[in-house]
Structure formats: structure tokens, C-alpha cells
């Protein structure tokens, strides 16, 4: 006779393992026991288990409520066992013992690997702002056994380094993506990959990008510079900028205060029918968090009866 | 041929604890299974629980919990503690060893009698 294992039996932490041994005998050959034990390299033999034809499934004190017969039905030449709850410290070789009559005793060895799916996490990096050279966006970290391959998955150009470190059982992965912070990658995302043998799809963790700027500042309103006569209604000023975090606007008149009647409403100044004391130099003053912009304009409010020149000038300040 | 020679039994209260012990002599290198057999007053003797020269062991359900089996294999010895006993534990508790050659109980002691009452 002979008998019948595998060379390795994989198990997920936490999954039940099933330790296979069964005894190919000829014709008339019994199966009096199987015995199993635990036999690492360096380190005495220590039995799990003892499966007797007649008595039934023994089990070692140090394995109780954790090692089980496969269920029925079961040939009593099969010695498979199912140890319970396989942990990480279950991994290493294991040897079957069957003591059969007449033919005696076979055994053979098999080895318990026990793969432990990671729970990777992401860290972002420091704020990241437009202007900044190379800089950490984030870094992600998996540990596991056997290590884990992480990954990312963005759109956004950039670059990654790795490192491992090894744990007597595992062995932990930290991938970080570097890149040029630009306004454009505002709002992209990018997305930590992680696979492992014990993850049945691979685990996915998505950090949004936010990259702080604050563009140049510009007014508009003063296009059509013949509207800009007395006695005209309607007539506003809108503050142009785009940021992140969005920033506030602010107007002041170079010249003076603000004539009365003029009403600021966040990035537009409106204005009340004209007259030339609306005439003068208006700032406007943008801001967030990470910068500050400004713009201003001359508004020359014009006397249709007058036939002088009109003129309108623009000037941009940062 | 094994001989076993058991010790401890004795005349315990409902709740009490008793310590069994056995000896075994002469061909011990063909034994496997040690055990503890009992047999009541008009029943079956039963397998109270065995263990193996490696230590593994099995219980009856009915002593689960209570009952401990223990086995110095180099002094060929094999113990069983008993806690919490109940009158239904009375009976003539015997050592059993099994030979590696026949996977039977074929050796016993001559038994002692553990008798559980108020």
C-alpha cells in the first residue's frame, strides 16, 4: 500500500484546514490508526491528534475544540483530519503516521501554509500646493503573509518607490507616490492597489487629490468702454480667480472709499446709475488660504456732452 | 504480556474529587492506547477515556469537563483525575492498555471500586 497527501495545503487565517492522509492498501489490509503530529524542523514531534479505528478521533490537550474528522461518510481508510480556525502560527510541516496490519507503518509529511490577507491602510501626505517641487501625495502600507504587492492606479503622473520589512510571520509593504503638485490633478484620484494570494479580489483604497492654488486675478465689466457714461444703470464689475480651497473676494477703491451707493456681493461690485464721482481706481483683492491675488482698473466715467477722449485703463498686480 | 496495577478509588460525597492511578509492567514497549474503562452495578462496561503515547486524548460525553486523563510515558504510568463527581460516576473503574499489535484493549487491572454518595 501507500499512502495519498499533499505536498502543501494553503489555508486563509480564520479558514478551516483540511490535513489530507489516506491509505491506498491492497486487498485485506486494515488501518489500525492514524496518528498526526506537528514535526518543525529543530523541535521534538508534538502529536495533534489520533485517529483510531476503533476508538474513535483523540486529540492533543493543546489542539482540544480545534481538530476534527472531515465529515461523514468517511472510509476507514481515509485519515484526513480538519484542523479548526487555522491561525498563523498553525503554519509548518506535518506528519501523518498510519499503522496498518499486516503491512505495517507509512508515513508522510506535508506543509500548512496560512496566508494572512493584509488591511492595507493610506496616509496622504502633507498639503500639497501648486508651485511645491517633488512631494509625498500619500503612502500606502500592507502587511501580510506572504508580503503583499502594492500598487497604485491614477491618472495623475508621478512616481513611487517601495520598501518591505520582514516580520518573523509576515511582512509589511509601504509603497508612497511622489509628484509635482499642478491645479489640474484638483479633485483626481488616486487609488492604493493591493493584492495578495489569501484576498479573493484585490482590496482598493482611493484618496482624492487636493492640490491648493490660486490663479491670477482679472476684472471684467469694462469691455464695452462707451457703456461706462453717466446716467447708466446696471452697470457691475466682476472679479475673475479660480482656487482651491475657493477663495473670497474683496473690493476697495484705490483712490478713496467706496462711493455710496455701490454694493459689493462677494467677487461682483454694482454700481447705481452712474455719475463721475464713480470714477477712480477699483482693487480687487482675492484670497484663500495658501495665496493672494489682486487686480485693479480705472473707471473713467464719461459725459456723453463731452467730446473728450475716452479711456479706460487695466492694470494687473500680483 | 502488560500488567497494569490501579490505585485511588474510594468512597466520595456528590461534588467531591478522586485521583485514579495505574502502573504498567512487563512488555510496555508494545502499548498504545492507555485507558480507563468503568462498569456499574447490571451494565456495560464503557471507555471512560483513553490518550495516546503522544498525548492525545478522548472522553465519553458524559465526563467531558471533569474528568482528566493524564500519562508519564517514561514511567509507564497513566492517572485520572476525577472533579465534580456525581452518584452516577459509581462503578468499578479498571486501566486498560492497548497493544500496538492487535489495536484492542487487551491488557486490564483488576479494578477499584470509586462509589459516589451522601
Known amino acids: 500500500g501507500e499512502l495519498e497527501t499533499s505536498d502543501v495545503v494553503t489555508v486563509v487565517l480564520g479558514q478551516d484546514a483540511k490535513l489530507p492522509c489516506f491509505y491506498r492498501g491492497d486487498s485485506g489490509e486494515q488501518v489500525g490508526q492514524v496518528a498526526w503530529a506537528r514535526v518543525d524542523a529543530g523541535e521534538g514531534a508534538q502529536e495533534l491528534a489520533l485517529l483510531h479505528s476503533k476508538y474513535g478521533l483523540h486529540v492533543s490537550p493543546a489542539y482540544e475544540g480545534r481538530v476534527e474528522q472531515p465529515p461523514p461518510p468517511r472510509n476507514p481508510l481515509d485519515g484526513s483530519v480538519l484542523l479548526r480556525n487555522a491561525v498563523q502560527a498553525d503554519e509548518g510541516e506535518y506528519e501523518c503516521r498510519v499503522s496498518t496490519f499486516p503491512a505495517g507503518s507509512f508515513q508522510a509529511r506535508l506543509r500548512l501554509r496560512v496566508l494572512v490577507p493584509p488591511l492595507p491602510s493610506l496616509n496622504p501626505g502633507p498639503a500639497l500646493e501648486e508651485g511645491q517641487g517633488l512631494t509625498l501625495a500619500a503612502s500606502c502600507t500592507a502587511e501580510g503573509s506572504p508580503a503583499p504587492s502594492v500598487t497604485w492606479d491614477t491618472e495623475v503622473k508621478g512616481t513611487t518607490s517601495s520598501r518591505s520589512f520582514k516580520h518573523s510571520r509576515s511582512a509589511a509593504v509601504t509603497s508612497e507616490f511622489h509628484l509635482v503638485p499642478s491645479r489640474s490633478m484638483n479633485g483626481q484620484p488616486l487609488t492604493c492597489v493591493v493584492s495578495h494570494p489569501g484576498l479573493l479580489q484585490d482590496q482598493r483604497i482611493t484618496h482624492i487629490l487636493h492640490v491648493s492654488f490660486l490663479a491670477e486675478a482679472s476684472v471684467r465689466g469694462l469691455e464695452d468702454q462707451n457703456l461706462w457714461h453717466i446716467g447708466r444703470e446696471g452697470a457691475m464689475l466682476k472679479c475673475l480667480s479660480e482656487g482651491q480651497p475657493p477663495p473670497s473676494y474683496n473690493w476697495t477703491r484705490l483712490d478713496g472709499p467706496l462711493p455710496s451707493g455701490v454694493r459689493v456681493d462677494g467677487d461682483t461690485l454694482g454700481f447705481p446709475p452712474l455719475t463721475t464721482e464713480h470714477s477712480g481706481i477699483y482693487v480687487c483683492h482675492v484670497s484663500n488660504e495658501f495665496s493672494s491675488r489682486d487686480s485693479q482698473v480705472t473707471v473713467d466715467v464719461l459725459d456723453p456732452q463731452e467730446d473728450s477722449g475716452k479711456q479706460v485703463d487695466l492694470v494687473s498686480a500680483s | 504480556e502488560v500488567q497494569l496495577v490501579e490505585s485511588g478509588g474510594g468512597l466520595v460525597q456528590p461534588g467531591g474529587s478522586l485521583r485514579l492511578s495505574c502502573a504498567a509492567s512487563?512488555?510496555?514497549?508494545?502499548?498504545?492506547?492507555m485507558g480507563w474503562f468503568r462498569q456499574a452495578p447490571a451494565k456495560q462496561r464503557e471507555l471512560v477515556t483513553s490518550?495516546?503515547?503522544?498525548?492525545?486524548?478522548r472522553y465519553a460525553d458524559s465526563v467531558k469537563g471533569r474528568f482528566t486523563i493524564s500519562r508519564d510515558v517514561a514511567k509507564n504510568t497513566v492517572d485520572l483525575q476525577m472533579n465534580s463527581l456525581r452518584a452516577e460516576d459509581t462503578a468499578v473503574y479498571y486501566c486498560?492498555?492497548?497493544?500496538?499489535?492487535?489495536?484492542?484493549?487487551?491488557?486490564w487491572g483488576q479494578g477499584t471500586q470509586v462509589t459516589v454518595s451522601s
Open positions: 512487563g512488555s510496555i514497549s508494545s502499548i498504545n492506547l
Open positions: 486498560a492498555a492497548e497493544s500496538e499489535r492487535t489495536y484492542y484493549f487487551d491488557s
Open positions: 490518550i495516546s503515547p503522544g498525548g492525545s486524548v
